[in-house]
């Protein structure tokens, strides 16, 4: 249980953000690879791709959504599919790649700040009580941000990306969730891994900015898989 792992600062003190919004398809944030706690399954990397069965979008990586692999296929057989790029057809926001959303059946850019607040974030309620385990369950929640009068600046607390000023997204940062900058070229990013467990991810990063994608750093191929760095690079 959590109490056996967190032996020092009492779990009662854990802020909601530590169980807060994890990145999901269509969201502005990406979870940095965290340490998987006891009881968690190992992440399955995207690099050696295999069909990954799922029941909902949250079980897939941020660059994926959950759906039947064939048009009009059996709804009972769903796998994680690659997200749809800009101008591709869609039926819901989660189908579109990070930085985009589904509008009138087409994936369009959500870089403009007007939409970001409408993107729901997944709240992993792993820390509801003293008996909670690390295998939390998640549900979709639309968080109200009416309490925020002005857009949050870099480092200020937030509930969701719409609370943050333009060029920032709301992402977990150890103790809290704060407004962080959208990533620039060369900055460290997170290559999304499948959510094979609800491991506690204590850092999240925003997505790479326009014209950039998160790819392995060229001079880090010799490093072990678990510690390879990815950076935002030009397409």
């Amino acid at each position: 249980t959590l109490n056996s792992v967190l032996n020092s600062n009492a779990i009662k003190n854990l802020p909601p953000p530590l169980g807060g919004a994890a990145g999901h398809p269509g969201s502005a944030v990406s979870a940095a690879p965290g340490i998987l706690y006891p009881g968690g399954n190992k992440y399955q990397t995207i690099d050696n791709y295999q069909p990954y069965p799922c029941a909902e979008d949250e079980e897939c990586g941020t660059d994926e959504y959950c759906a039947s692999p064939t048009r009009g296929g059996d709804a009972g057989v769903q796998i994680c599919l690659a997200c749809r790029k800009r101008r591709k057809r869609c039926m819901r926001h989660a189908m579109c790649c990070p930085g985009n959303y589904c509008k009138n059946g087409i994936c369009v850019s959500s870089d403009q700040n007007h939409f970001r607040g409408e993107i729901e974030e997944t709240i992993t309620e792993s820390f509801g009580n003293d008996h909670s385990t690390l295998d939390g369950y998640s549900r979709r929640t639309t968080l109200s941000s009416k309490m925020y009068h002005t857009k949050g600046q870099e480092g200020s607390v937030c509930l969701r990306s719409s609370d943050c000023a333009s060029g920032l997204c709301c992402a977990r940062h150890f103790w809290s969730k704060i407004c962080k900058p959208v990533l620039k070229e060369g900055q460290v990013c997170t290559k999304h891994r499948r959510k094979g467990s609800h491991g506690l991810e204590i850092f999240q990063r925003c997505y790479c900015g326009e014209g950039l994608s998160c790819r392995i750093q060229k001079d880090h191929h010799q490093a072990s898989n678990s510690s390879r760095l990815h950076t935002c690079q030009r397409h």
């Epitope: 792992v5 020092s8 600062n9 802020p15 940095a32 965290g34 607390v157 809290s176 506690l200 204590i202």
Partner: antibody, heavy 113, light 108 residues
Framework: QVQLVESGGGLVQPGGSLRLSCAAS????????MSWVRQAPGKGLEWVSV????????YYADSVKGRFTISRDNSKNTLYLQMNSLRAEDTAVYYC?????????WGQGTLVT | DIALTQPASVSGSPGQSITISCTGT?????????VSWYQQHPGKAPKLMIY???NRPSGVSNRFSGSKSGNTASLTISGLQAEDEADYYC???????????FGGGTKL
């Protein structure tokens, strides 16, 4: 611009108490987590405690747990550190730091001996 | 406990480049790719120079850069200048104790 000014340091006997204050200005104080970090003379930095923007969460280093209490008054833009049962090893400069993306702004510190 | 190990001192000449290392373990630096760096001049408050491995806050010279490989993070200062003479600290977080952790510091 962001400004953090600590006060309340001084000379105190072992076992005594002291309350440090940190006056914040130049930013929306109530929107940021805040921390105390200390530095013993000639030594490195040691994180002491952190408090959430709304005071609902607090965390402490093992070395001060049960003796120090962090608090804040958002209406006064002030951070506090109540230090009880002080020991010789608590001698240090105590810095107030804003915890945005890490410790992004620091005060000049107040010396506790 | 998490401990970040830094060399006690590093030296260089004006115009040169130097690198300061910060070594952790697979369960901290190696595990979640997060480290920050601070500069502290004698008698002054620390200043955040690099966050999240290689990000510079606004106002920090691009002569300062960060990187990480495996369990070791590095701060590189190119084109050394006299005003770079200071103490440098790396910092990460301990997810078990829910605390922030600093390295022992390196005198440049």
């Amino acid at each position: 611009q962001v400004q953090l000014v600590e006060s309340g340091g001084g000379l105190v006997q072992p076992g005594g108490s002291l309350r440090l204050s940190c006056a914040a200005s130049g930013f929306t104080f109530s929107s940021y987590w805040m921390s105390w970090v200390r530095q013993a003379p000639g030594k490195g930095l040691e994180w002491v405690s952190v408090i959430s923007s709304d005071s609902s969460s607090t965390y402490y280093a093992d070395s001060v747990k049960g003796r120090f209490t962090i608090s804040r008054d958002n209406s006064k833009n002030t951070l506090y550190l109540q230090m009880n049962s002080l020991r010789a090893e608590d001698t240090a400069v105590y810095y107030c730091a804003r915890h945005g993306i890490d410790f992004d702004h620091w005060g000049q510190g107040t010396l506790v001996t | 406990d998490i401990a970040l190990t830094q060399p006690a001192s590093v030296s260089g000449s004006p115009g040169q480049s130097i690198t300061i290392s910060c070594t952790g373990t697979s369960s901290d630096l190696g595990g979640y790719n997060y480290v920050s760096w601070y500069q502290q001049h004698p008698g002054k408050a620390p200043k955040l120079m690099i966050y999240d491995v290689n990000n510079r806050p606004s106002g920090v010279s691009n002569r300062f850069s960060g990187s990480k490989s495996g369990n070791t993070a590095s701060l590189t200062i190119s084109g050394l200048q006299a005003e770079d003479e200071a103490d440098y600290y790396c910092q990460t977080y301990d997810q078990i104790k829910l605390s922030a952790v600093f390295g022992g510091g390196t005198k440049l």
